[in-house]
Amino acid sequence: LTCLGGFASPGPVPPSTALRELIEELVNITQNQKAPLCNGSMVWSINLTAGMYCAALESLINVSGCSAIEKTQRMLSGFCPHKVSAGQFSSLHVRDTKIEVAQFVKDLLLHLKKLFREGQFN
């Protein structure tokens, strides 16, 4: 038998859950890393205390063809209130240092874990 009954759409994910899911994905990336992440691609370092979510996306979106971070890129696009395209940098984004994607992910993960522990879900 095929059930064609409609389902109520799931409610919006609470910020705390959304943050936890992003942390879990970043943990997954760091734990499953065998070869250099994204072939050692370099991205702009960001200020983790200033408009972090959009800045992180603006940096990572410039990495293409790296399946390991595609889910992270998708998740971050939902964390940013404006649409981010490759090559776009907001005024919150200071472009002075490039680091490897693997280091970027580790730094972001550490900071998000700290926010989660402190209950800063906004």
Epitope: P15, M52, P81, H82, K83, S91, G119, Q120, N122
Partner: antibody, heavy 118, light 109 residues
């Protein structure tokens, strides 16, 4: 010149569904998130949700998630907001607005008044 | 869900200074809340004044400035003009949705 032109006022009965359109010009809709905001008479602003017209991905406010549907047609540069199971407290002006970093919510539609009355 | 609170009303003298605040029930407001401030006059659509905490929209007069102040987003109006009399709203981003503030009615008297 950037413009967001919304469809006209509606008077509907409780339980009905309303569909409001927001036709944009002066930019390509797929390059921006489009947000929708409700304002009941004499009340404040309430964010309803947003859509990425390029892929249809949506985010909804908890209050509206089970009754609102946001869609967009990139071929006509038009965003749509559908609100179902209308009740009297849905009587409000509904705004579409373009959001981008270099001037978030900078451009707003003129608003569409929806009156729900039996 | 978070609640975003503003002063219900404030009065400022012409040429005077007034600061409106935007408080989050979940804790300190940060730059990751991408605070926006809007001005709305009766019968008109809202108009963006400040975005991303402290960036002025191209049409926003220099007398308006945005900042973070004591864990809240703040809008300071220095040198108030009669035309600044309006309702002011803030909006904060909470990871995946916006919440508007309750609004502040500013009277220039």
């Amino acid at each position: 010149e950037v413009q967001l032109v919304q469809s006209g006022a509606e008077v509907l009965k409780p339980g009905a569904t309303v569909l409001i359109s927001c036709k944009v010009s002066g930019f390509t809709i797929k390059d921006y998130y489009m947000h929708w905001v409700q304002q009941a008479p004499g009340k404040g602003l309430e964010w309803m949700g947003r859509i990425d017209p390029e892929d249809g991905e949506t985010k909804y406010a908890p209050k509206f998630h089970d009754r609102v549907t946001l869609t967009a047609d990139t071929s006509t540069d038009t965003a749509y907001m559908e609100l179902s199971s209308l009740r009297s407290e849905d009587t409000a002006v509904y705004y579409c607005t373009r959001y981008d970093y270099y001037g978030p919510f900078a451009y707003w539609g003129q608003g569409t008044l929806v009156t729900v009355s039996s | 869900q978070a609640v975003v609170t503003q002063e219900p009303s404030l009065t400022v003298s012409p040429g005077g200074t007034v600061t409106l605040t935007c408080r989050s029930s979940t804790g300190a407001v940060t730059t990751s809340n991408y605070a926006n401030w809007f001005q709305q006059k009766p019968g008109q659509a809202p108009r963006t004044l400040i975005y991303g905490t402290n960036n002025r929209a191209p049409w926003t007069p220099a007398r308006f400035s945005g900042s973070l102040l004591g864990g809240k987003a703040a809008l300071t109006l220095s040198g108030a003009q009669p035309e600044d009399e309006a309702e002011y709203y803030c909006a904060l981003w909470y990871i995946n949705h916006f919440i508007f503030g309750t609004g502040t009615k500013v009277t220039v008297l």
